[in-house]
Amino acid sequence: EVEKTACPSGKKAREIDESLIFYKKWELEACVDAALLATQMDRVNAIPFTYEQLDVLKHKLDELYPQGYPESVIQHLGYLFLKMSPEDIRKWNVTSLETLKALLEVNKGHEMSPQVATLIDRFVKGRGQLDKDTLDTLTAFYPGYLCSLSPEELSSVPPSSIWAVRPQDLDTCDPRQLDVLYPKARLAFQNMNGSEYFVKIQSFLGGAPTEDLKALSQQNVSMDLATFMKLRTDAVLPLTVAEVQKLLGPHVEGLKAEERHRPVRDWILRQRQDDLDTLGLGLQGGIPNGYLVLDLSMQEALS
């Protein structure tokens, strides 16, 4: 805290300009009026105030706005934003996407900090939903943003926003998140033709049910192995050898390299060895010829 001292004669700031950089901390505190600072915040960002001076400027704004800064001030914080705590940010009401962008720009190239996470949370809650423009902005700055949300939070994403999602935005999503996102993507891309649809939906397929995979197998999509390996095991297991062959097209040969890994391993265990042999890949572990397969879960349901 800077102690209160009278401003030396002739040093009272009439405007926020570069001369203030040479003011000592106590001079800045005494000679710069908080209201002047607030009305000329657009200049603050252009002036390379020292580390200590930024503390003084923050202190002045905190005194002027104990309930939280107005958006006109927030938009021009620049490096001052990095002096804010999550507690400070929780007092803000940020509604403009331009303000959000300006603050994200300050933290660009760095991982998401608690301050940024709080800012985004305040912004999204204020908007009521994660609209396309917001999602576009957030994933541009933080490709992993979408996958940092809980399934509950993802449920507020409207299908129209899915158009903003790039494949790399989903890299760290887990199956529970993809379960929420996939139906939205399916709805968003429903009017596209076969090949275009597959290109768009491919990243979301980790949330696809069996019936959708069966439908895709009829469309000559040639799914790559990386996508296949991310499919839900429970969705892959009911697929027949013929369906998997059609789904993967020329990529079917890749199954051999993945035969010990899920979901391929579990899928092999469910197939007749005879059927697997038709692929000519040397896949082993299928159900031997002559064995009867009982679906015990079905039997339990009936009894």
């Epitope: 930024l54 991982e111 998401m112």
Partner: nanobody, 119 residues
Framework: QVQLVESGGGLVQAGGSLRLSCAAS????????MYWYRQAPGKERELVAF???????NVRDSVKGRFSVSRDSAKNIVYLQMNSLTPEDTAVYYC?????????????WGQGTQVTVSS
């Protein structure tokens, strides 16, 4: 992290010149502005000059026309050229910067270099 190392200080006669250097290493791409401070015996530390990443510079009024600041971006070195030195310029000179790191600002200082101006 940023490391700052000053050099070039020493004993000089009034009216003489010195050139101080501040070599930065580490996360130098994050550096925006570099500052030169000084602290004379029994006095509080004061800002002498700065240079921004864009190359704009400024020096405090008491050294205007005598001190100038420049940089060699390729070598990550900032210089403080001091001419027409007076005994009042005697102080330990420090270079300083701050960078954004993990969502907050981190302040870095060099160890300082002593400048003594004799009359």
């Amino acid at each position: 992290q940023v490391q700052l190392v000053e050099s070039g200080g020493g004993l000089v006669q009034a009216g003489g010149s010195l050139r101080l250097s501040c070599a930065a290493s580490g996360s130098t791409s994050s550096i925006n502005t570099m500052y030169w401070y000084r602290q004379a015996p029994g006095k509080e530390r004061e800002l002498v000059a700065f240079i921004s990443s864009g190359g704009s510079t400024n020096v405090r009024d008491s050294v205007k026309g005598r001190f100038s600041v420049s940089r060699d971006s390729a070598k990550n070195i900032v210089y403080l050229q001091m001419n027409s030195l007076t005994p009042e310029d005697t102080a330990v000179y420090y270079c300083n910067t701050y960078i954004p790191l993990r969502g907050t600002l981190h302040d870095y200082w060099g160890q300082g270099t002593q400048v003594t101006v004799s009359s």
